[in-house]
């Protein structure tokens, strides 16, 4: 009886169960009653990452420097090239097809997580007792100055954007 289903890593064609081509190879000709599937390795600039019956290999991704991309990991016959972004830039999507500059955290916000080639800066509001008076992609919220430790008193309260202003203690009783 001709098979109606085939085992893992096989495919059904012309009532025959044929072996799929292994990762890194493409299909040249299907198996027959008396011959095996014929597969050929992908060329240097191509890949196939699964057991397959593809007649063409996929082209490796091109990391276009004009889009701020650079190679993070060179592709093989079994894996695609992985792109990442140049310094100061991060990917716009998971597939990393283009890059944009890292976001800066505005005054009143500090950097919670510094950006990488694949993720943007994560900002957080400065909590009470902390401030940020700059627009920065690196600076965290800084604590207000402790006037007491300097034997001074608070003359002007701090905000999330400004430090406290310390001044000398009033000597009069």
């Amino acid at each position: 009886e001709p098979p109606t289903a085939c085992r893992e890593k096989q495919y059904l064609i012309n009532s025959q169960c044929c072996s799929l081509c292994q990762p890194g190879q493409k299909l040249v000709s299907d198996c027959t009653e008396f011959t095996e599937t014929e597969c050929l390795p992908c060329s240097e600039s191509e890949f196939l990452d699964t057991w397959n019956r593809e007649t063409r290999c996929h082209q490796h991704k091109y990391c276009d420097p004009n889009l701020g991309l650079q190679v993070q990991q060179k592709g093989t016959s079994e894996t695609d090239t992985i792109c990442t972004c140049e310094e100061g830039l991060h990917c716009t999507s998971e597939s990393c097809e283009s890059c944009v500059p890292h976001r800066s955290c505005l005054p009143g916000f500090g950097v919670k997580q510094i950006a990488t080639g694949v993720s943007d800066t994560i900002c957080e509001p400065c909590p009470v007792g902390f401030f940020s008076n700059v627009s920065s992609a690196f600076e965290k919220c800084r604590p207000w100055t402790s006037c007491e430790t300097k034997d001074l008193v608070v003359q002007q309260a701090g905000t999330n954007k400004t430090d406290v202003v310390c001044g000398p203690q009033d000597r009069q009783r």
């Epitope: 009886e1 198996c31 008396f34 011959t35 095996e36 014929e38």
Partner: antibody, heavy 123, light 107 residues
């Protein structure tokens, strides 16, 4: 002992018929594709046809030179292969070999042969 | 049909000689190439299948190689029992076809 023994050869007139037999022993006959190969006197080998095994429905394939004139069959209960030859021609004169066709997808081959039986077509 | 051309059609050699027989297919046969030995009045005997796989019981002085359309049978050191006719056969496409044979004779 694993062997194939042909019989039934002889002298036959052009247009006549003949049936060759091949008795198999020492292996599970129904598991194998069985074939006929012939050799004209002083010439090379020519594949005649084969019959598939039980798993493949005992279907047949033939060389163009004999298609429609020759029929291959088998009796698995007797472990015997047959070649029915009709409308015989002078060019069918040859030693006829019964051969087992075996192997895997990494190459099939005739791995067991009978001793051959001579068929002479002449008036 | 795939045509199989053997060369030479005959050769003379001495015991101990290295002998090479070639077989050319009319199209690529992807290594589906078998070699047989036949002695006068006897049935052929399988020597090598799938280009280079030695059949069980065949001496290691016999070897096969090749790819695409061109294949070779080599006998590394000819023995007295090796004087015979050798045939190649393609097993990729029906009808199965054989080469014309190479007769190895004693010099």
């Amino acid at each position: 002992e694993v062997q194939l023994v042909e019989s039934g050869g002889g002298l036959v007139q052009p247009g006549g018929s003949l049936r060759l037999s091949c008795a198999a022993s020492g292996f599970t006959f129904s598991d194998y594709y069985m074939s006929w190969v012939r050799q004209a006197p002083g010439k090379g080998l020519e594949w005649v046809g084969f019959i598939r095994n039980k798993a493949n429905g005992y279907t047949t394939e033939y060389a163009a030179s004999v298609k429609g004139r020759f029929t291959i069959s088998r009796d698995n209960s007797k472990s015997t292969l047959y070649l029915q030859m009709n409308s015989l021609r002078a060019e069918d004169t040859a030693v006829y070999y019964c051969a087992r066709y075996g192997g895997l997808k990494k190459g099939w081959y005739f791995d067991l042969w009978g001793q051959g039986t001579l068929v002479t077509v002449s008036s | 049909d795939i045509q199989m051309t053997q060369s030479p059609s005959s050769l003379s050699a001495s015991v101990g000689d290295r002998v090479t027989i070639t077989c050319r297919a009319s199209q690529g046969i992807r290594n589906y190439l078998n070699w047989y030995q036949q002695k006068p009045g006897k049935a052929p005997k399988l020597l090598i299948y799938y280009t280079s796989s030695l059949q069980s019981g065949v001496p290691s002085r016999f070897s096969g190689s090749g790819s695409g359309t061109d294949y070779t049978l080599t006998i590394s050191s000819l023995q007295p029992e090796d004087f015979a006719t050798y045939y190649c056969q393609q097993g990729i496409n029906l009808p199965w076809t054989f080469g014309g044979g190479t007769k190895v004779e004693i010099k």
